[in-house]
Interface confidence: medium
């Protein structure tokens, strides 16, 4: 799994006129990470585990950068023409990454009213637009919009880029949170089912980081991918992970399942509780 | 309308250095950038790199980063590309392919092709 | 770098018959490209984005697929459509293509 940042504003505007805040939200490694709270006009680590990312360090630097980005939004959403009455919305969710192996990739993706029209590769500089005549339209008032302003030229879209992916290595780098190894806590649990069937679940909860392995076997044989249900891992609000994978068994023979887990090089079998 | 015409077939000793040509011709040629594609007789397609012809900037297939020089003179609209130590493996048509801004822009436009022959 | 495998490598297929070549990448990519060639010329855009069909190309194309796996669709095989075709990313660099796959017809 790469590293990741991922940053998602929003800009709304009410009969043509573009509103004074913005919603913003930061994801790390695709943990809820920062927000921007509008009464303090200030970014807030989301919970214990964000604030340890920095340790006592503030979030001034965080705050600057989430300000500059909502007022360039702001300014994008005033030159989209088709602003009718009521309530509109501008999305920008930006993301860069770094692999395994130390490449980087980044991207940037506009929505209004919740709908994609926009997408910018920002290593390649390419765009690319939904085929819907509604978002070829935005899109091309956004970009005459985005060229025309000196800010954003190419350069700005890589320096965007560059400091995305510096803020996220001062995130790894400084971080002892993110390089930790947290084991996972597994519960195996069974439900009846019909005709003498049972489902068994395996839970793995509080792991970081992401990758796991979860798998139902058969006297030590793993199970057919298409015999089992697995859960998606998904954070679960403490910069920790959650997944499950569940099959069904026939009663009686609960004894011959084991669930298989293999985590940062370490692995375990849980049997099912009779 | 857009055209990309490429300089004509080489014969080179290995050892020697070729440089080729792209003439771009029926748009802006500093508003896009322009990339270099290899292909070998009866093989595949290889991106080799690309050079922005408004600043000069260039982007390099590690693989080819060595023996490969992208280079282009505005004022006359050519994008060049130097080969230099050559062998045999670098007998092959080499294409320049256009670069693009929206998605249906890139790789629309493609030269007619260098046909480079290696040979003692 | 990403490393794309299309399959086959070469296949025929009667005019009238369904034709689906498949492309896999060794990473998730956001979209893939397709490229026809014929012999003695340069490769054509074909598909771009996944899905969108470049100018000029029959409505019997569609391309398809997310992640790691893609592919290129013709609904009914006609005799123009024999070529090599090719998969594209430029999901990061270097931009790779896929091997290709030389359609026959019979």
């Known amino acids: 799994e790469p590293h990741s940042l991922r940053y998602n504003l929003t800009v709304l505007s009410w009969d043509g006129s573009v509103q004074s805040g913005f919603l913003a939200e930061v994801h790390l490694d695709g943990q809820p990470f920062l927000r921007y709270d509008r009464q303090k006009c200030r970014a807030k680590p989301q919970g214990q585990w964000a604030e340890d990312v920095l340790g006592n360090k503030t979030w001034d630097r965080e705050t600057r950068d989430l300000t500059g980005n909502g007022k360039d939004l702001r300014m994008t959403l005033a030159h989209i023409k088709d602003q009718k009455e009521g309530l509109h919305s501008l999305q920008e969710i930006r993301v860069c990454e770094i692999h395994e192996d130390n490449s980087t990739r980044s991207s940037q993706h506009f929505y209004y009213d919740g709908e994609l029209f926009l997408s910018q590769n920002v290593e390649t500089e390419e765009w690319t637009v939904p085929q819907s005549s509604r978002a070829q339209t935005l899109a091309m008032n956004v970009r005459n919009f985005l060229k025309e302003d000196a800010m954003k030229t190419k350069t700005h879209y890589h320096a965007m880029h560059a400091d995305c992916l510096q803020e996220l290595r001062r995130y790894l780098e400084s971080s002892v949170v993110l390089r930790r190894r947290v084991p996972p806590m597994v519960n195996v649990t069974r439900s009846e089912a019909s005709e003498g069937n049972i489902t068994v679940t395996c839970r793995a909860s509080s792991f970081y980081p992401r990758n796991i392995t979860l798998t139902w076997r058969q006297d030590g044989v793993s199970l057919s991918h298409d015999t089992q249900q697995w859960g998606d891992v998904l954070p679960d609000g403490n910069g920790t992970y959650q997944t499950w994978v569940a099959t069904r068994i026939c009663q009686g023979e609960e004894q011959r399942f084991t669930c298989y887990m293999e985590h940062s090089g370490n692995h375990s079998t849980h049997p099912v509780p009779s | 309308q857009v055209q990309l015409q490429q300089s004509a077939a080489e014969l080179a000793r290995p050892g020697a250095s070729v440089k080729m040509s792209c003439k771009a011709s029926?748009?802006?040629?500093?508003?896009?950038?322009m990339h270099w594609v290899k292909q070998r007789p009866g093989q595949g397609l290889e991106w080799i790199g690309y050079?922005?012809?408004?600043?000069?900037?260039?982007e390099y297939n590690q693989k080819f980063k060595d023996k490969t020089t992208l280079t282009v003179d505005k004022s006359s609209t050519t994008s060049y590309m130097q080969l230099s130590s050559l062998t045999s493996d670098n007998s092959a048509v080499y294409y320049c392919?256009?670069?693009?801004?929206?998605?249906?822009?890139?790789?629309?436009?493609w030269g007619q092709g260098t046909l480079v022959t290696v040979s003692a | 770098q990403i490393v794309l495998t299309q399959s086959p490598a070469i296949m025929s297929a009667s005019p009238g018959e369904k034709v689906t070549i498949t492309c896999s990448a060794s990473?998730?990519?956001?979209?893939m490209h397709w490229f026809q060639q014929k012999p003695g010329t340069s490769p054509k855009l074909w598909i771009y984005s996944t899905s969108k069909l470049a100018s000029g190309v029959p409505a019997r194309f569609s391309g398809s697929g997310s992640g790691t796996s893609h592919s290129l669709t013709i609904s009914r095989m006609e005799a123009e459509d024999a070529a090599t075709y090719y998969c594209q990313h430029r999901s990061t660099y270097p931009f790779t293509f896929g091997s290709g796959t030389k359609l026959e017809i019979k």
């Open positions: 050079i922005n012809p408004s600043s000069g900037y260039t």
């Open positions: 990473s998730s990519i956001s979209y």
């Open positions: 029926g748009y802006t040629f500093t508003s896009y950038t």
């Open positions: 392919a256009r670069g693009g801004d929206w998605d249906v822009d890139w790789f629309v436009y």
